[in-house]
């Protein structure tokens, strides 16, 4: 089995995903739009994120407003805001399976069960992981294409912000945690045990006769 | 260039419906906000509602909520505004926009040229 | 909804320096952006965001303000400026217009 250092890494990195991914999600910077002034005084940054726009004055000054209609935002958002959702339930999930299924726990006596526990968060983290990087990296592939494509109004080209960065960490730290706890292997002592039982059971029945 | 061309004139019995249209050109349709407003002449202006082109769906004012409904058609890259139960209130010039600055923080950059909409018995 | 309100009408001669101002009911942060139209004609956007400068739009137009006072300078005004300047906020929901102020030239 692999050993207590591994997995509490593996355990670590994911929880720390996790948190990433929901500071992913709240986060308003998904795509920023800079507007320069005549002046650095009238310049100004529009935010947007998977709930709310911001707009940020050059003095530091931020004014935050969640979206108006749900209806009328584009697919590529709705689906973005349901699959971060998602993955940070997911990874809920997978926390309370590693908590289940640690060694340092006493949830779960049997250390064979254990060991499957921990193979299926690692699987639901690698789960979470991939649902993260997908919106993250479908929005950011957006954002690019848009850029250099000339039918998009300058007024409309975004560049990428930090919620997508931050969007990638939290999907790496959730493959390379679940990745460390699906290296968890399941104990080997059933069939020496077995070999053991039988022996013992055919001697008895040898002393029988 | 963006180009936006509205439909021609319309005389219409109170009661009964029109359906403005509003051709687009010189910009991805299908990842474009397009925005419906409307003057009565000599006053001020009404921004009606916006519709997602893409997936059509739309964002209205409330006022305009049992009044106006938008739709568009990505394959000819036409937005479309349906106006019912027509009164004299209602007459008016109707302008078709698209707007920049994200999801809902509008300006409106290009204009159509406006329908104007008389409404009389 | 949030109110926007114009002064109603302007006379000023050309070369001088005009003053447009809208004040809004409730704070708009710098979500306010101005038009001039022509009689017979559709608007035509000249400021966003209080104080940018629309592409293609004299440098003779600015504007400034944020929260619920703003203003929009003409200088100088020339004869071609002839028009009303509507304001519009777009923080609020729904996206409101001013009544316009009618600029006229003595």
């Known amino acids: 089995m692999a050993s207590m250092g591994l997995q509490v890494m593996g355990i670590a990195l994911a929880v720390l995903g996790w948190l990433a991914v929901m500071l992913c999600c709240a986060l308003p910077m998904w795509r920023v739009t800079a507007f320069i002034g005549s002046n650095i005084v009238t310049s100004q940054t529009i935010w947007e994120g998977l709930w709310m726009n911001c707009v940020v004055q050059s003095t530091g000054q931020m004014q935050c407003k969640v979206y108006d209609s749900l209806l009328a935002l584009p697919q590529d958002l709705q689906a973005a805001r349901a699959l971060v959702i998602i993955s940070i339930i997911v990874a809920a999930l997978g926390v309370l399976l590693s908590v289940v299924g640690g060694k340092c726990t006493n949830c779960l006596e049997d250390e064979s069960a254990k060991a499957k526990t921990m193979i299926v968060a690692g699987v639901v983290f690698l789960l979470a992981g991939l649902m993260v990087i997908v919106p993250v990296s479908w929005t950011a592939h957006n954002i690019i294409q848009d850029f250099y494509n000339p039918l998009v109004a300058s007024g409309q080209k975004r560049e990428m912000g930090a919620s997508l960065y931050v969007g990638w960490a939290a999907s790496g730290l959730l493959l390379l945690g679940g990745g460390l706890l699906c290296c968890n292997c399941p104990p080997r002592t059933d069939k020496p045990y077995s070999a053991k039982y039988s022996a013992a059971r055919s001697a008895a029945a040898s002393n029988y006769v | 260039q963006v180009k936006l061309l509205q439909s021609g004139a319309e005389l219409v019995k109170p009661g009964s419906s029109v359906k403005l249209s509003c051709k687009t050109s010189g910009f991805t349709f299908n990842k474009s906000y397009m925005s419906w407003l409307k003057q009565v002449p000599g006053q001020s202006i009404e921004w009606i509602g916006n519709?997602?082109?893409?997936?059509?769906?739309?964002h209205y004012n409330q006022k305009f909520k049992n009044k106006a409904t938008l739709t568009v058609d990505t394959s000819s890259s036409t937005a479309y505004m349906d106006l019912s139960s027509l009164t004299s209130e209602d007459s008016a010039l109707y302008f078709c926009a698209r707007p920049d600055g994200g999801y809902n923080l509008n300006w409106f950059v290009y204009w159509g040229q406006g329908t104007l909409v008389t409404v009389s018995s | 909804d949030t109110v926007l309100t114009q002064s109603p009408a302007l006379a000023v001669s050309p070369g001088e320096r005009v003053t447009i101002s809208c004040r809004a009911s409730?704070?708009?942060?710098?979500?306010m952006n101005w038009y001039q139209q022509k009689p017979g004609q559709q608007p035509k956007l000249l400021i966003y965001?209080?104080?940018h400068l629309e592409s293609g739009v004299p440098a003779r137009f600015s504007g400034s303000g944020s929260g619920t006072d703003f203003t929009l300078t003409i200088d100088p005004v020339e004869a071609d400026d002839t028009a009303t300047y509507y304001c519009q906020q777009s923080w609020n929901d729904p996206k409101t217009f001013g009544v316009g102020t009618k600029l006229e030239l003595k």
């Open positions: 409730e704070s708009v942060t710098t979500l």
């Open positions: 519709i997602y082109a893409g997936h059509g769906g739309t």
């Open positions: 965001l209080a104080s």
